[in-house]
């Protein structure tokens, strides 16, 4: 109850919000390490994984690592760490630290990488008391495009097993979207025929409950009436309708996962690891 | 194209100072740390200063600490080597390099120390 | 301070392999970077992070880390491999870069 704990939670605290005073940044006793973290421009599909490696040239022996996102003020927000053999997941558990088997290099992975994950990263090292310092990484740009769903027509000629996979897909597609018609034409006729029948219940969708795919799932492709023309383009989804008694029904087919075609990504979760930094940045640390 | 590419180097008396340059261009010279190397003729290959990104940490060589000052300004994509109180053994080919990895070099500056 | 040890000379038969070793006191733990240098030239980084070639380093350039030894393997020597070759490794408690004393590397 009454024991004296010293100042440490408080120089913690500090260490932790990611801001450093002046007099921390450079002891001069203290062992430290240069750090690396590449590459130094990553560009992924949102959807993807977006990784990054963050490299000490030696292992001291007490040291913290932190993952930390740039902000629009030059501030450092903190996004994960790694501290004496364990992994400090942030708020956001998209964000995951790795420690790799040489003991120097960590995996920062973002995953499922959104549009406003675009940005500035970096790594640092805060190397333990006494003589308390830190140590900063180079900074690494990542930008997260927007899925590009060409048409199957640009793209280079596949190989026919392929275009063959993609016809019948296009058949199937077409019939399963009649089937639906007729059944949704057959609701409708209900709907006129039995009008309060349909009133009572009304199913809201949840806008945080997206459509998910488990690590081991098949993907999972959708398709909404405005692709029935067939042209593979990229719409960008209206916010949900409020929920009322007299909601007109959409539905969505989903098809269980099928091979990739040329015109479609097959998964949102396939691993984006180490992409080669810019030509302007030489080979930097990624081999060929 | 990745360039890195040093100046300053002399014939300089002992004791006499020294301003080494290196300019760097074709890459973001402020996100790499940076090395001074150099090479006594027909010796082996001799680390002598780092600065890291931002320019906030910088190592030295045990024979040139209290002597020798690496700087960078990024405004100008260049890497300095200030060298003071300079000694016969400091004569060598001095090199600056992209740190962790050293993946581009200069071509060098020959600096020479003698009387 | 750190050491670095390699030996001063080393042979190869023209498409052999050579090993060239680099010893240190718990090297592997430390990033080891490897650098030809041939006469009159800079150095030239051929492996970092242990084992990692950059881009334009022909893959018969392998290396390794563990324990206290490090090692460059030139799987099937050629004439142009002829040179000196440097490992260099960063040391956190004395914080310095530290190169080896090179090997010069023969090809018969």
């Known amino acids: 109850m009454g024991s004296r704990r010293g100042p440490w939670p408080l120089v913690w605290a500090v260490l932790q919000l990611g801001w450093w005073p002046g007099w921390l940044l450079d002891s001069p006793d203290r062992p430290w390490s240069p750090l690396t973290f590449s590459p130094a421009q990553l560009t992924v599909q949102e959807g993807e994984n977006a990784t990054f490696t963050c490299s000490l040239a030696d292992i001291p022996d007490s040291f913290v690592l932190n993952w930390y996102r740039l902000s629009p003020r030059n501030q450092t927000d903190k996004l994960a760490a790694f501290q004496e053999d364990r992994i400090e997941p942030g708020r956001d558990r998209r964000f995951r630290v790795t420690r790799l088997p040489n003991g120097r290099d960590f995996h920062m992975s973002i995953v499922a990488a959104r549009l406003n994950d675009s940005g500035i990263y970096l790594c640092g090292a805060i190397y333990l008391p006494p003589n308390t310092q830190i140590n900063e990484s180079p900074r690494a740009e990542l930008s997260v495009t927007e899925r590009t769903l060409e048409p199957p027509t640009q793209s280079p000629s596949p190989p026919p097993r392929l275009s063959g996979q993609l016809q019948g897909l296009v058949i199937g597609v077409t019939s399963v979207l009649v089937g639906v018609l007729l059944l949704l034409l057959l609701t409708w006729v209900l709907a006129a025929v039995f009008p309060r029948a349909t009133r009572g219940a009304c199913v809201c969708g949840s806008e945080d409950e997206p459509l998910k795919e488990g690590p081991d799932a098949a993907p999972v492709f959708t398709l909404d009436y405005g692709e029935l023309d067939f042209q593979w383009r990229e719409k960008t989804p209206e916010p949900p309708a409020p929920c009322a008694p007299e909601q007109t029904e959409y539905a969505t087919i989903v098809f269980p996962g099928r091979p990739a075609s040329p015109g479609r990504r097959a998964s949102a979760s396939s691993l984006q690891g180490a992409q080669p930094p810019s030509p302007e940045d030489g080979p930097g640390l990624w081999p060929p | 194209e990745v360039q890195l590419v040093e100046s300053g180097g002399d014939l300089v008396k002992p004791g006499g100072s020294l301003r080494l340059s290196c300019l760097a261009s074709?890459?973001?010279?402020?996100?790499?740390?940076m090395n001074w190397v150099r090479q006594a003729p027909g010796k082996g290959l001799q680390w002598v200063a780092f600065?890291?990104?931002?320019?906030?940490?910088?190592a030295y060589a045990d024979g040139v600490k209290g002597r020798f000052t690496i700087s960078r300004d990024d405004a100008k994509n260049t890497l300095y080597l200030q060298m003071d109180s300079l000694r016969a053994d400091d004569t060598a080919v001095y090199y600056c390099?992209?740190?962790?990895?050293?993946?581009?070099w200069g071509q060098g500056t020959l600096v020479t120390v003698s009387s | 301070s750190y050491v670095l040890s390699q030996p001063p000379s080393a042979t190869v038969t023209l498409r052999q392999t050579a090993r060239l070793t680099c010893g240190g006191d718990?090297?592997?733990?430390?990033?080891v970077e490897w650098y030809q240098q041939k006469p009159g030239q800079p150095p030239v980084l051929i492996i970092f992070?242990?084992?990692s070639r950059p881009s334009g380093i022909p893959e018969r350039f392998s290396g390794a880390n563990s324990g206290n030894t490090a090692t460059l393997t030139i799987s099937g020597a050629l004439a142009e491999d002829e040179a000196d070759y440097y490992c260099q490794v960063w040391d956190s408690s004395t914080k310095a870069w530290v190169f080896g004393e090179g090997t010069q590397l023969t090809v018969l």
């Open positions: 992070g242990d084992s």
């Open positions: 390099a992209r740190a962790f990895p050293g993946d581009y």
């Open positions: 600065v890291n990104v931002g320019g906030i940490r910088t």
């Open positions: 074709g890459f973001t010279f402020s996100n790499f740390h």
């Open positions: 718990s090297i592997g733990r430390k990033s």
